[in-house]
């Protein structure tokens, strides 16, 4: 029963991680511009995500512009989008597989098969976590590298936004949840040990006693 509890905990953590990956992908705060600029007097903050860039003004008004043309997007941004989306889709599959394989559900009756299905779900969650971790870490690395790169001007230097932190948290939850699901080892098959049955015949005093029969040797032709 403790194993079922661990399974459920793993599933909940991985599910929360999957939700986090969706939130991270949707958030427009992946990169925050640390230098607003001389001519943008009203701007408080400028930030961009995978799908749009936004300007938050001192009035409280937020104006966002969706990246409309795929052709104008850098290959890095397109790859980041792709990995995040594939990670989310993989998470969907993992959720369905886990639901089928968990001990607390009755979709499959065979315990060995259920355990194997849960392990598959765990592996899928681990892969989903990696697919989230790679683009998030790559984006963070680019931001840090640019920050110290003297060629990148002040106006283009960026800071890490909430989207990246949510992405890391999501990946961590999926990794943890996936690992817990992978710990669902198939139940060991019961081994029936053959009990030795010793048959002892009534003792006979004659020389034939060693044969375990009630006959004397002389009775054999």
């Amino acid at each position: 029963m403790a194993n079922a509890g661990l399974q459920l905990l793993g599933f909940i953590l991985a599910f929360l991680g999957w939700i986090g990956a969706i939130v991270s992908t949707a958030l427009p705060q992946w990169r925050i511009y640390s230098y607003a600029g001389d001519n943008i007097v009203t701007a408080q903050a400028m930030y961009e995500g995978l799908w749009m860039s936004c300007v938050s003004q001192s009035t409280g008004q937020i104006q966002c512009k969706v990246f409309d043309s795929l052709l104008n997007l850098s290959s890095t941004l397109q790859a980041t989008r792709a990995l995040m989306v594939v990670g989310i889709l993989l998470g969907v599959i993992a959720i369905f597989v886990a639901t089928v394989g968990m001990k607390c559900t009755n979709c499959v009756q065979d315990d060995t098969a259920k355990a194997k299905i849960t392990i598959v779900a765990g592996v899928l969650f681990l892969l989903a976590a990696l697919l989230t971790l790679v683009p998030v870490s790559w984006s963070a690395n680019t931001i840090i590298r640019d920050f110290y790169n003297p060629v990148v001007p002040e106006a283009q230097k960026r800071e890490m936004g909430a989207g990246l932190y949510v992405g890391w948290a999501a990946a961590a939850l999926q990794l943890l949840g996936g690992a817990l699901l992978c710990c669902s080892c198939p139940p060991r098959e019961k081994k029936y040990t053959a009990t030795k049955v010793v048959y002892s015949a009534p003792r006979s005093t004659g020389p034939g006693a060693s044969l375990g029969t009630g006959y004397d040797r002389k009775d054999y032709v």
Epitope: Y35, G37, D38, S74, Y148, N149, P150, V151, V152, P153, E154, A155, Q156
Partner: antibody, heavy 118, light 108 residues
């Protein structure tokens, strides 16, 4: 007044070394990335190297990698360019320039002439 | 061989409008800011335009900058004799600063 003043140029033999200096005044030197740009006689502008405000990070044009070294001393408000293994084609006016917020060279020095000849 | 391509020369008569082009790539002009410089004979270059279209302090309104895709241009309207100089465009990519070869503007 915002000003950059280069010094250290002159005549040097091929294979020789030279160290250029650039004294900054009128602005917070430690807040800006600084750069060296050169101009050969009758030719266009050519970027040489750049250094970030703290001096921790530098970048050089590919052709100067290994021969030229940019450095700065923020306590002295001075930028340096150490040039080694000089060649005849390094003959040029070397300008020190401030790298502005938008990736433009907003302040330039008057330049110092470096002549590499035997 | 310069990374950014500029016409070697341009000319115009006083009062005329002249445009100088600067062609680059996605990694420099296409993605980053463009600056324009004026270099009068025997002097250091002077910044005219930064952030692609913003005029530097003291630069007359006759000068304007624009960008489209991987190309940028500097327009000078109401040309004057004192505008006769060399003009350079400049941008950067991830690791290097790049200049155009320069355009010699002659006021006829």
């Amino acid at each position: 007044e915002v000003q950059l003043l280069e010094s250290g140029g002159g005549l040097v033999q091929p294979g020789g070394s030279l160290r250029l200096s650039c004294a900054a005044s009128g602005f917070t030197f430690s807040s800006y990335a600084m750069s060296w740009v050169r101009q050969a006689p009758g030719k266009g502008l050519e970027w040489v190297s750049i250094i970030n405000p703290s001096g921790a990070s530098t970048s050089h044009a590919q052709r100067f990698q290994g021969r030229f070294t940019i450095s700065r001393d923020n306590s002295k408000n001075t930028l340096y360019l150490q040039m080694n293994s000089l060649r005849a084609e390094d003959t040029a006016v070397y300008y020190c320039a401030r790298y502005g917020r938008y990736g433009s060279f907003d302040i330039w020095g008057q330049g110092t002439l470096v002549t590499v000849s035997s | 061989q310069s990374v950014l391509t500029q016409p070697p020369s341009a000319s115009g008569t006083p009062g005329q409008r002249v445009t100088i082009s600067c062609s680059g790539s996605t990694s420099n002009i296409g993605r980053n800011y463009v600056s324009w410089y004026q270099q009068l004979p025997g002097t250091a270059p002077k910044l005219l335009i930064y952030d692609t279209s913003n005029k530097h302090f003291g630069v007359p309104d006759r000068f304007s900058g624009s960008k489209s895709g991987t190309s940028a241009s500097l327009a000078i309207s109401g040309l004057r004799s004192e505008d006769e100089a060399d003009y350079y465009c400049q941008s950067y990519d991830s690791s290097k600063v790049v200049f155009g070869g320069g355009t010699k503007l002659t006021v006829l």
